[in-house]
């Protein structure tokens, strides 16, 4: 037994009996210790939702998740988890995954708004887009619940000691 003490630099609700947190949803990358879409918070000693830090902190384990989050905020785009890239639906309408269904179906109803290559496709000129075909399998994005972010992660060590006391 011990405890945190002197610093050289200055210084809820009841749950039905057992609450179980299975250790599921790990990525195969680098034997992660936190589930996908979460990052290790060393001060709290737990896994936190990447959602809480996407806007203001670079956390390498959250990079892909934060990219996908910002991508999904852009209209007419979706995040391809295999390519790890933000894809424009306009470029793949006709071979689109379900994430682009709303965008592509609306575009197909109003040909005026279609890009030239798709207007050609609709008028019978088929362009060879073999590098796109079969690539988009419509991977579903599993969102994780936001956890309260720990305030003050960018503080100095002195300030951190105060925040966490």
């Amino acid at each position: 037994m011990s405890g945190l003490g002197r610093s050289r630099r200055g210084g809820r609700s009841r749950v039905d009996q057992e609450e179980r947190f299975p250790q599921g949803l790990w990525t195969g990358v680098a034997m992660r210790s936190c589930p996908e879409e979460q990052y290790w918070d060393p001060l709290l000693g737990t896994c936190m939702s990447c959602k809480t830090i996407c806007n203001h902190q670079s956390q390498r384990t959250c990079a892909a998740f934060c990219r996908s989050l910002s991508c999904r905020k852009e209209q007419g785009k979706f995040y391809d988890h295999l390519l790890r890239d933000c894809i424009s639906c306009a470029s793949i309408c006709g071979q689109h995954p379900k994430q682009c269904a709303y965008f592509c179906e609306n575009k197909l109803r109003s040909p005026v708004n279609l890009p030239p290559e798709l207007r050609r496709q609709r008028s019978g000129e088929v362009e060879n887009n073999s590098d796109n075909s079969g690539r988009y399998q419509g991977l579903e994005h599993r969102g994780s619940e936001a956890s309260p972010a720990l305030p003050g992660l960018k503080l100095s060590a002195d300030q951190v000691a105060l925040v966490y006391s």
Partner: antibody, heavy 117, light 111 residues
């Protein structure tokens, strides 16, 4: 006074399971993560995983995936670790520890698990 | 995983002298202006006791003769003047990356 009281020693047969407990007191249970550490006889320490009573975040050492399961009972401020499919390699002392500000500041007294036929 | 290499594996120091234990990390454990390196003392049959956290801060009730230093990848635990009660195993431990990892330990004895 912060205390982490662990359950007593266990003698179990190979292939069996065991569930050990860590009852906490002296602080707000939901404010700290509880972690488990393995110490094989005369060896160093090995982190197994942790469980956060507050947000459900469960950092976990992939080496122990399929071996250890962590659960929490908020009503009694107790954390449990179940170890399954035990073999002689699982014979060790297992500690629970409270995590705060990047360190495990309070530790339980340890639970000895001996796997023997 | 971050690998921590402790040296020496064992150390015998006279009472009143300085004991220095080193710990080298395979990558930096610095995090927003802090170094997330901790030191534990362990006596036979007892749990580890936190003596230094965040590289240089003393744990609760830890005597002033224990001090820690270092940043990045290289850290030291100093005990001076050494007392009889300071014998035991000492482990460094990093918290920056999961999984948290421990050094192999240093056995400190009185010469």
């Amino acid at each position: 006074e912060v205390q982490l009281q662990q359950s007593g020693p266990e003698l179990v047969k190979p292939g069996a399971s065991v569930k050990i407990s860590c009852k906490t007191s002296g602080y707000t249970f939901t404010e700290s993560t509880i972690h488990w550490v393995k110490q094989s006889h005369g060896k160093s320490l090995e982190w197994i995983g942790g469980i956060s009573p507050n947000n459900g975040g469960s950092p976990f050492n992939q080496k122990f995936k399929g071996k250890a399961t962590l659960t929490v009972d908020k009503s009694s401020s107790t954390v449990y670790m179940e170890l399954r499919s035990l073999s002689s390699e699982d014979s060790a002392v297992y500690y629970c520890a409270k995590w705060v500000r990047g360190a495990m500041d309070f530790w339980g007294q340890g639970t000895s698990v001996t796997v023997s036929s | 995983d971050i690998v921590l290499t402790q040296s020496p594996a064992s150390l015998a120091v006279s009472l009143g002298q300085r004991a220095t234990i080193s710990c080298r990390a395979s990558e930096s454990v610095d995090y927003y202006g802090m170094s997330l390196m901790n030191w534990f003392q362990q006596k036979p049959g007892q749990p580890p006791k936190l003596v230094i956290y965040a590289a240089s801060n003393q744990g609760s009730g830890v005597p002033a003769r224990f001090s820690g230093s270092g940043s990045g990848t290289d850290f030291r635990l100093n005990i001076h003047p050494l007392e009889e009660d300071d014998t035991g195993m000492y482990f460094c431990q990093q918290s920056k990356e999961a999984p948290p990892t421990f050094g192999g330990g240093t056995k400190l004895e009185i010469k």
